[in-house]
């Protein structure tokens, strides 16, 4: 399965939209910073078969979509930007789902992939727990926005590596 160039562009558009969503200066939230322990090794495409990498990407985008589809998220962000952002993520999920179906037929995905997906889920659990602990404050959302921008940047790099493998 060849991930279309439009998928990468969609990811870039999602990053740009997320960058525009801020309502307060990140510099007023320096104290709120938190180490979410991003599972960087899961974004290293070198150690994965293609099917594994695609399902990690899918999980990453799915969890991001879920995070920004909550009522608390709707209250935190400007509605039209949030809708555009969610639309970009939804389109990427569709692209990736088609690829997952195609690739899993070609390669049997070993248990290692389940570990990778679990690592991504736990990472998003840590993000959600942080938001709950900080009572979904504007600064907590600002920190989460920065973190998701980081993880989307990692996933963009993983996509580039996948295309180079093709």
């Amino acid at each position: 399965c060849d991930l279309p160039q439009t998928h990468s562009l969609g990811n870039r558009r999602a990053l740009i939209l997320l960058g525009q969503m801020g309502r307060i200066s990140p510099f007023s939230c320096l104290k709120d910073r938190h180490d979410f322990r991003i599972p960087q090794e899961e974004f290293d495409g070198n150690q994965f078969q293609k099917a594994q990498a695609i399902s990690v990407l899918h999980e990453m985008i799915q969890q991001t979509f879920n995070l920004f589809s909550t009522e608390d998220s709707s209250a935190a962000w400007e509605q039209s930007l949030l809708e555009k952002f969610s639309t970009e993520l939804y389109q990427q999920l569709n692209d990736l789902e088609a690829c997952v179906i195609q690739e899993v037929g070609v390669e049997e995905t070993p248990l290692m992939n389940e570990d990778s997906i679990l690592a991504v889920r736990k990472y998003f659990q840590r993000i959600t727990l942080y938001l709950i602990e900080r009572k979904y404050s504007p600064c907590a959302w600002e920190v989460v926005r920065a973190e998701i921008m980081r993880s989307l940047s990692f996933s963009t790099n993983l996509q580039k590596r996948l295309r180079r493998k093709d």
Partner: antibody, heavy 121, light 113 residues
Framework: QVQLVQSGAEVKKPGSSVKVSCKAS????????ISWVRQAPGQGLEWMGG????????NYAQKFQGRVTITADESTSTAYMELSSLRSEDTAVYYC??????????????WGQGTLVTVSS | DIVMTQSPDSLAVSLGERATINCKSS????????????LAWYQQKPGQPPKLLIY???TRESGVPDRFSGSGSGTDFTLTISSLQAEDVAVYYC?????????FGQGTKVEIK
């Protein structure tokens, strides 16, 4: 290993501008804030401002507002500090320092080697 | 802006003896949401950039010898060098990162008596 490498020493005339660069390697550039700190000869440390590359958002100390511009180029992992309307009292060593936005403490954990800017007619 | 005041301005201590530097902030740098003090200590030797020693008022940066320790909370902080070594001769700065603009103390010069 994270490294911040700054551009070389500059000699400038009063009223002119200087632009100092700071190239980062060995870390995820966009995940951090880059601060600029200056130190006049024999004096203490003074925070001028900073930028969070992932947002492109800069913040400046009131003293330098309107005279300093801090930018970042994610594609080259380089931050820049431009100071305009230079006067003799701007003669100092200018440092860039990484502030771990992407981590869980706020401290300047890696520093550039410093750039001496001399303002003299 | 938060004003940071260090004392003393300079300090002469015999090798192997204890050196104590104080730092006072004009307002609390303790953040109630995570109970952390946003105060750091740096060491600067001549011709070199500052080096981070302590963050969160009392957490040693990795690789920093355990003779360096930080304490205090709210507005009053202390950096202690338990047994001064020749290589500890430097200027020490406290810095708050509770709010922008970040501000530094004026520095304390530590020398050997």
């Amino acid at each position: 290993q994270v490294q911040l490498v700054q551009s070389g020493a500059e000699v400038k005339k009063p009223g002119s501008s200087v632009k100092v660069s700071c190239k980062a390697s060995g870390g995820t550039f966009s995940s951090y804030a880059i601060s600029w700190v200056r130190q006049a000869p024999g004096q203490g440390l003074e925070w001028m401002g900073g930028i969070i590359p992932i947002f492109g958002t800069a913040n400046y100390a009131q003293k330098f507002q309107g005279r300093v511009t801090i930018t970042a180029d994610e594609s080259t992992s380089t931050a820049y500090m431009e100071l305009s309307s230079l006067r003799s009292e701007d003669t100092a060593v200018y440092y860039c320092a990484r502030d771990s936005w992407g981590s869980y403490y706020a401290a300047l954990d890696y520093w550039g080697q410093g750039t001496l800017v001399t303002v003299s007619s | 802006d938060i004003v940071m005041t260090q004392s003393p301005d300079s300090l002469a201590v015999s090798l192997g003896e204890r050196a104590t530097i104080n730092c006072k902030s004009s307002q609390s740098v303790l953040y109630s949401s995570n109970n952390k003090n946003y105060l750091a200590w740096y060491q600067q030797k001549p011709g070199q950039p500052p080096k981070l020693l302590i963050y969160w008022a009392s957490t040693r940066e990795s690789g920093v010898p355990d003779r360096f320790s930080g304490s205090g909370s709210g507005t009053d902080f202390t950096l202690t060098i338990s047994s001064l070594q020749a290589e500890d001769v430097a200027v020490y700065y406290c810095q708050q990162s509770f709010d922008v603009p970040y501000t530094f103390g004026q520095g304390t010069k530590v020398e050997i008596k």
